[in-house]
C-alpha cells in the first residue's frame, strides 16, 4: 500500500517551489492540462550555455514524513538531447541530481540550508533513459522518463527534496512522494493494523476481531516488510467466541442466527438447536430448554434437552411369607435419556390402621434406590401389615424438575402369623395297638394355641388313604388301633386364630410286639 506525501499531479494551486540562485535560466513553473483536463504543474530548466560551475537548484516545499522511515520519489521527466540543441555548449548535460534535506519544521529559506551537498544529502544522479530530440520548427519528440528513488532512513519530522541542474534542458513533469506501508489486514480472524515499516521486516502483533478470542499458543503476529507487503500468513490466529461463527473469508465473526448455537470457541459453524431447545436471540452459545425439559449438570452444552421419565408400568408382586418380590416394566417415556434408574418409597399400616413410613427393619435387595434393573426383593415384612410401595423411574434431570414425580403404586398385605412347627414329640407310653404322645406347647406370636392336629401313618404306607388325622386340644394325644410291632411316622401342627402352623418334623415311633412288654414310656 502506498501513502502519498506529495503528488504534483493532484496539486490545484501553483507549486511555488524555491529556486536558487535568482538568475536567468533558472527553473520555471509551467501549467497545463492533463488527459482528463485537470490542471497540472511542471518545472522546466534549459540553461545549456551556463557558466562552468553554475548550478540551478529547485527545492520542494517541506514535506512531513508522517512516520515513514523510507520515502520513495517517482519522477516523470523529459530530457532534451544536447546534440539537438543548436546553442548547446560543452556544459550541456543529460543528467540531474536529486538531494534531500531533513528538518523538524519548515525552516528552510531562500538561502538556507546552504545550497550544496552536505547539508543536503545526495540521493542519486539521474540519467535519462529516453532523450527528446528537437529539430528547428518542429515539435520535440521523445518518451517520458520515469524514475523511482529511495530516500532515507529519515528521522526528523519532515524533509525537502531538491533537484540540481548543471546544464540540462529538461522538464520535471511530475513528482510523486510516497511511502510504503502494510495495509490493515484481517486474516484468520486476526486484525493486523496498518503498519509503516521502520526496518527490513517489522513484527506486528495482531488482535482478535470483534467476537473472536485468541487461539491457544503464542499470540498471533505477522511481519511487515519494507516493500509494504505482509510476510507469510500467521500460523496461529483467533477463533470465534461461543455463539459466533467465522464469516466473510475468515475475516469476521458472525453471531449465530436465532434457532442456532455454537457452544465452544474455535472452528466450526453454528448448529441448529438440539431437540427440545430453542434460541430466541442471535449469538447464542447455548440453546435454552423448552419448558419441562432440562440439561443435567454433566450434559454437554450442545446436548439435547431431556425430561424426567414417566412412571414405571405393571408392577407385579410375589409375597412369600415375610419376603416380597416386586418387578415392573420400564416407563413408556424415558425422557430421552439413557441414565434411567428406579427408586422405591414405602409406607406400612399396622393391623390397627395407623400408618407410617416403613421402618428400618425392612431390607431391599439390591437397594431402595439407584436400581438399574426393574426388580427388587423386600425382606423383613411384618405379618398382618399392609405395605404400599411407590415405584418411581428417575433420570439425570429428575432432580431439576419441579412438581410431583410420577409413580406406580402397589399394595401388599402380609398374612397374620401362625404358630411355629411343633417339634420335640415324645412317646410317653406304647402298647401293641396304641401310642401315647406329648410335645412342648409352641410359642404362638398372635394369641394362644387353640388346638393341635396330629398326622400319622405306618411307615412304608405312603398313599393318601393310609394317612390318619387326630385333633386334640391338649399338647398330648393317644393313637389307637395301631398294628402290633409296627413303625409309625408322626407329625403335629398347632392352630391359633391366625390358622394352622406348619407340621413339624416326622417323628419315628414303634408299637409293642406283645402285651407282656406292658406299657412303657419312650423318649422321642
Amino acid at each position: 500500500l502506498e501513502e502519498t506525501l506529495l503528488n504534483t499531479k493532484l496539486e490545484t494551486a501553483d507549486l511555488k517551489w524555491v529556486t536558487f540562485p535568482q538568475v536567468d535560466g533558472q527553473w520555471e513553473e509551467l501549467s497545463g492540462l492533463d488527459e482528463e483536463q485537470h490542471s497540472v504543474r511542471t518545472y522546466e530548466v534549459c540553461d545549456v550555455q551556463r557558466a562552468p560551475g553554475q548550478a540551478h537548484w529547485l527545492r520542494t516545499g517541506w514535506v512531513p514524513r508522517r512516520g515513514a522511515v523510507h520515502v520513495y520519489a517517482t519522477l516523470r521527466f523529459t530530457m532534451l538531447e544536447c546534440l539537438s540543441l543548436p546553442r548547446a555548449g560543452r556544459s550541456c548535460k543529460e543528467t540531474f541530481t536529486v538531494f534531500y534535506y531533513e528538518s523538524d519544521a519548515d525552516t528552510a529559506t531562500a538561502l538556507t540550508p546552504a545550497w550544496m551537498e552536505n547539508p543536503y544529502i545526495k540521493v542519486d544522479t539521474v540519467a535519462a533513459e529516453h532523450l527528446t530530440r528537437k529539430r528547428p520548427g518542429a515539435e520535440a519528440t521523445g518518451k517520458v522518463n520515469v524514475k523511482t528513488l529511495r530516500l532515507g532512513p529519515l528521522s526528523k519530522a519532515g524533509f525537502y527534496l531538491a533537484f540540481q541542474d548543471q546544464g540540462a534542458c529538461m522538464a520535471l513533469l511530475s513528482l510523486h512522494l510516497f511511502y510504503k506501508k502494510c495495509a490493515q489486514l484481517t486474516v484468520n480472524l486476526t486484525r493486523f493494523p496498518e503498519t509503516v515499516p521502520r526496518e527490513l521486516v517489522v513484527p506486528v502483533a495482531g488482535s482478535c476481531v470483534v467476537d473472536a478470542v485468541p487461539a491457544p499458543g503464542p499470540s498471533p503476529s505477522l511481519y511487515c516488510r519494507e516493500d509494504g507487503q505482509w510476510a507469510e500468513q500467521p500460523v496461529t490466529g483467533c477463533s470465534c467466541a461461543p455463539g459466533f461463527e467465522a464469516a466473510e473469508g475468515n475475516t469476521k465473526c458472525r453471531a449465530c442466527a436465532q434457532g442456532t448455537f455454537k457452544p465452544l470457541s474455535g472452528e466450526g459453524s453454528c448448529q441448529p438447536c438440539p431437540a427440545n431447545s430453542h434460541s430466541n436471540t442471535i449469538g447464542s452459545a447455548v440453546c435454552q430448554c423448552r419448558v419441562g425439559y432440562f440439561r443435567a449438570r454433566t450434559d454437554p452444552r450442545g446436548a439435547p434437552c431431556t425430561t424426567p421419565p414417566s412412571a414405571p408400568r405393571s408392577v407385579v408382586s410375589r409375597l412369600n411369607g415375610s419376603s416380597l418380590h416386586l418387578e415392573w416394566s420400564a416407563p413408556l417415556e424415558s425422557g430421552g435419556r439413557e441414565d434411567l434408574t428406579y427408586a422405591l418409597r414405602c409406607r406400612e399400616c399396622r393391623p390397627g390402621g395407623s400408618c407410617a413410613p416403613c421402618g428400618g427393619d425392612l431390607t431391599f435387595d439390591p437397594g431402595p434406590r439407584d436400581l438399574v434393573e426393574p426388580w427388587v426383593v423386600v425382606r423383613g415384612l411384618r405379618p398382618d401389615f399392609t405395605y404400599t410401595f411407590e415405584v418411581t423411574a428417575l433420570n439425570g434431570v429428575s432432580s431439576l424438575a419441579t412438581g410431583p414425580v410420577p409413580f406406580e403404586p402397589v399394595n401388599v398385605t402380609t398374612d397374620r402369623e401362625v404358630p411355629p412347627a411343633v417339634s420335640d414329640i415324645r412317646v410317653t407310653r406304647s402298647s401293641p395297638s396304641s401310642l401315647s404322645l406329648a410335645w412342648a406347647v409352641p410359642r404362638a406370636p398372635s394369641g394362644a394355641v387353640l388346638d393341635y392336629e396330629v398326622k400319622y401313618h405306618e411307615k412304608g404306607a405312603e398313599g393318601p388313604s393310609s394317612v390318619r388325622f387326630l385333633k386334640t386340644s391338649e399338647n398330648r394325644a393317644e393313637l389307637r388301633g395301631l398294628k402290633r410291632g409296627a413303625s409309625y411316622l408322626v407329625q403335629v401342627r398347632a392352630r391359633s386364630e391366625a390358622g394352622y402352623g406348619p407340621f413339624g418334623q416326622e417323628h419315628h415311633s414303634q408299637t409293642q410286639l406283645d402285651e407282656s412288654e406292658g406299657w412303657r414310656e419312650q423318649l422321642a
Epitope: D14, K16, L30, L80, A171
Partner: antibody, heavy 128, light 108 residues
Framework: QVQLVESGGGLVQPGGSLRLSCAAS????????MSWVRQAPGKGLEWVSL??????????SYAAGVKGRFTISRDNSKNTLYLQMNSLRAEDTAVYYC???????????????????WGQGTLVTVSS | DIELTQPPSVSVAPGQTARISCSGD??????VHWYQQKPGQAPVLVIY???KRPSGIPERFSGSNSGNTATLTISGTQAEDEADYYC???????????FGGGTKLTVL
C-alpha cells in the same frame, strides 16, 4: 521580429457580430498558448479568453461575461488567432489585445502563467 | 475565484521608492505577475513569478509576494516609470486569469 498584430475592430451595433484577428510572427505560433485581453475606455485590463497550443488539445476557456457569445480559435497554418464575437453589447466596447503566454522551451502542452508578449490592440465599439 | 485588489493611485517623488500592493486571499500561494501600461500603449510584463525580471526590464523593478499581499517595488523611481500597473494571477482552475483593478503611479 517577435510581434503580435490585431485587426478587425470597428463600430458595430448591439446584437451584431465581429471577428478579430491576431497575426503572430517571429516565434513558433503553434507552440504558443494565446489569449485575448480587453480594456474598456478608462478602465483596467480584463481577461477574455484563452486557447492552448495545438499539442495541448487546443482546449479553450472564457471569462464568465462572454461565455456562449465569444469563440476563440486559431489557424496554425496562418499563424493567426481569432475571436468571433456575437450578440455584442455596449459593455463589450473596449480595446482588445492579443497576448501570448510564456512558452515552454520545447513542450507546448505546458505554458508559463504570465503574458510575455502583447499586441498593440484593436478598438471595438458597440453602439447604436 | 480570487479577487485582486490594488490601490487606485500611488504617488512618488523622483528617485524615491514606490511600492504598489496587490492583495487577495492567500495570494502568497500563487504566482503574481506585474504589467506596466503607459497611455495609448499595450501592457508590458515587468515582473513575473513574483520576483523575476524579464530581460530588458531595469533592475530597479523588483517584486515580492507573501501572505495575502504581493508588492511591486520601484527603487529610484524615474519619470518614465509613470504608468498604470496591473497585477495578475491564475485562478485555481488554471485556465482563467485575473487582473487587479490597476494602480496609477504618478511621479511627482
Amino acid at each position: 521580429q517577435v510581434q503580435l498584430v490585431e485587426s478587425g475592430g470597428g463600430l458595430v451595433q448591439p446584437g451584431g457580430s465581429l471577428r478579430l484577428s491576431c497575426a503572430a510572427s517571429g516565434f513558433t505560433f503553434n507552440n504558443a498558448w494565446m489569449s485575448w485581453v480587453r480594456q474598456a475606455p478608462g478602465k483596467g485590463l480584463e481577461w477574455v479568453s484563452l486557447i492552448e497550443a495545438k499539442e495541448a488539445n487546443g482546449a479553450t476557456s472564457y471569462a464568465a461575461g462572454v461565455k456562449g457569445r465569444f469563440t476563440i480559435s486559431r489557424d496554425n497554418s496562418k499563424n493567426t488567432l481569432y475571436l468571433q464575437m456575437n450578440s455584442l453589447r455596449a459593455e463589450d466596447t473596449a480595446v482588445y489585445y492579443c497576448a501570448r503566454k510564456g512558452m515552454s522551451f520545447y513542450n507546448n502542452k505546458y505554458a508559463k502563467s504570465m503574458f510575455d508578449l502583447w499586441g498593440q490592440g484593436t478598438l471595438v465599439t458597440v453602439s447604436s | 475565484d480570487i479577487e485582486l485588489t490594488q490601490p487606485p493611485s500611488v504617488s512618488v517623488a523622483p528617485g524615491q521608492t514606490a511600492r504598489i500592493s496587490c492583495s487577495g486571499d492567500n495570494l502568497g500561494k500563487k504566482y503574481v505577475h506585474w504589467y506596466q501600461q503607459k497611455p495609448g500603449q499595450a501592457p508590458v510584463l515587468v515582473i513575473y513569478y513574483d520576483s523575476k525580471r524579464p530581460s530588458g526590464i531595469p533592475e530597479r523593478f523588483s517584486g515580492s509576494n507573501s501572505g495575502n499581499t504581493a508588492t511591486l517595488t520601484i527603487s529610484g523611481t524615474q519619470a518614465e516609470d509613470e504608468a498604470d500597473y496591473y497585477c495578475s494571477a491564475w485562478t485555481t482552475t488554471m485556465m482563467h486569469i485575473v487582473f487587479g483593478g490597476g494602480t496609477k503611479l504618478t511621479v511627482l
